[in-house]
Amino acid sequence: MPACCSCSDVFQYETNKVTRIQSMNYGTIKWFFHVIIFSYVCFALVSDKLYQRKEPVISSVHTKVKGIAEVKEEIVENGVKKLVHSVFDTADYTFPLQGNSFFVMTNFLKTEGQEQRLCPEYPTRRTLCSSDRGCKKGWMDPQSKGIQTGRCVVYEGNQKTCEVSAWCPIEAVEEAPRPALLNSAENFTVLIKNNIDFPGHNYTTRNILPGLNITCTFHKTQNPQCPIFRLGDIFRETGDNFSDVAIQGGIMGIEIYWDCNLDRWFHHCRPKYSFRRLDDKTTNVSLYPGYNFRYAKYYKENNVEKRTLIKVFGIRFDILVFGTGGKFDIIQLVVYIGSTLSYFGLAAVFIDFLIDTYSSNCCRSHIYPWCKCCQPCVVNEYYYRKKCESIVEPKPTLKYVSFVDESHIRMVNQQLLGRSLQDVKGQEVPRPAMDFTDLSRLPLALHDTPPIPGQPEEIQLLRKEATPRSRDSPVWCQCGSCLPSQLPESHRCLEELCCRKKPGACITTSELFRKLVLSRHVLQFLLLYQEPLLALDVDSTNSRLRHCAYRCYATWRFGSQDMADFAILPSCCRWRIRKEFPKSEGQYSGFKSPY
């Protein structure tokens, strides 16, 4: 291919040549595919709003928890158990948290009057000891509450534990109270203020609209837009029991989903609230179930810093805001339509698949002979022939052979390796249908050419009886008119070919051979048809006429132009043409592959 290209190469357009098949079946299949695909494309376009440019939500959240709880605490004072009533308000049970979260305390364990000094550890498997050998000075166990002094001291009675430097008395290892001390937190309410923004669409809104009844409480069906939630209802929605979760604590997700259609003609932008338990409720005791943390209230007593340590159990509510805002965008629409156009090619792919399958050799040889109802599918072979043009790779070894006593053409695509071309079986190829329009272009003279001396004027049919083999004709010759090749030994086998497969009359004896191949008048006409002002000397003319005769024979016997290029002429025909249009001196070169 040339490296440079002219201006005319730029201004050109290529398109495919198509085959239109008039078929009720395939027409129905095509429209069925097109209707289904068109319906799906339109449905997806509308239902998923694929004509919109979508943008994720940007949001801010603010919460307010309301409610009062009465707590009945059991405390031990001077060895006597006492029940103490206290009231907890928002400031007592909520803690400032970062991000979109708020925390509600539901249970707690208190260790009062702690100060920094030496004291025995609380008895556990890891802190109990029988001698000082079980304690190590300076040792800090991750589970411990202080730094060991290396002494094993009496904790209570005959229990001895390692002494530590820590906040004393050490916090007891005990279970969270049951039921939870702030069980009534179930009735607390939380107001969630959520402002959202779609900067790309220049749109801002919030979940609390003007005119909202602020005494409402959220209900999934009766009041789904109310931003005030009762904590117990949140747990009921997820199928959990608030009282059970309140003992150890947990994490609850409040999901706010904004699916906003910002088109003027279908404007809709309201939140959908849903709830999800986020902590692992099946956690093993050893893996710290629930949700808890410790915090301390510090104070001074007699100038000694003391603290009350509180282990707080409660529920952390995480507010998860997500969603998208979409607005009509012509580019999105064009991109979507473009991406779906290829689906319309599925009909063609499917129909081509059917044609290719039903016209395969497998169907022809195994299915059609036995399955009568499959017979109508044979028409696919016709469609296939019209649709596809099969070409063989033009290898140097490619040759086509035509015997007058066989209806098909043989394709030989192998090296002969010393064997006569006559004896090589090759592959059977159907003979192309004759295009009689080509004949009509031949001169009228073809029909009234003067007879060649010594031959009768009427058309001769090939004689049925075999021609007696001449003494000179080679072993492979079946017509008795072939001559040995003059080519070197290595190339000779290529010319060892007769016009027949079985013994019989030679094709050169037919009237048509004489009129189509040997008629100087016809051949000169064909040469002038190609080059009107052709003027050649006798020898050159003979050469041109000889090669034109070869071409005429190949076109006549092989039909297809592609096959004619690789056609090998039988020896009898070759020598008959050479006799008519001889070379003044030198050898004949024989067949040369055109590529």
Epitope: R125, R126, L128, C129, S130, R133, G134, W139, D141, Q143
Partner: nanobody, 129 residues
Framework: DVQLVESGGGLVQAGGSLRLSCAAS????????MGWFRQAPGKEREFVAA???????DYGDSVKGRFTISRDDAKNTVPLQMNSLKPEDTAVYYC???????????????????????WGQGTLVTVSS
């Protein structure tokens, strides 16, 4: 949970040897520190030897140099090889296991009976003079 079964106890002459074995059931055996304790009639339970899940060992003062503890995690066994036995070694020997899944038992606490959650039924060792 882990079940422990001791074997190999019996009567032996002073100066002789004996090999006790503790077989443990449970797939997580390799996460346990294993110990041998003994209790002579009318006395406190006394530490003999222990081996942590990562192979460090500790011995009671009275058995150092004579007893050897090891572990075979493939067979879930903890053998105790007792050599140069003395009449004062006569006692019921108990095998014990301490879970180290959530934190290893510090070496200096391998001798503490409080660290061990699971105990075997014991095997009697009698050393005659």
């Amino acid at each position: 949970d882990v079940q422990l079964v001791e074997s190999g106890g019996g009567l032996v002459q002073a100066g002789g040897s004996l090999r006790l074995s503790c077989a443990a059931s449970g797939r997580t055996f390799r996460h346990y520190a294993m110990g041998w304790f003994r209790q002579a009639p009318g006395k406190e339970r006394e530490f003999v030897a222990a081996i942590s899940s990562y192979g460090s060992t500790d011995y009671g003062d009275s058995v150092k140099g004579r007893f050897t503890i090891s572990r075979d995690d493939a067979k879930n066994t903890v053998p105790l090889q007792m050599n140069s036995l003395k009449p004062e070694d006569t006692a019921v020997y108990y095998c014990a296991a301490a879970d180290e899944t959530l934190g290893a038992v510090p070496n200096f606490r391998l001798h503490e009976k409080y660290e061990y959650e699971y105990w075997g039924q014991g095997t009697l060792v009698t050393v005659s003079s």
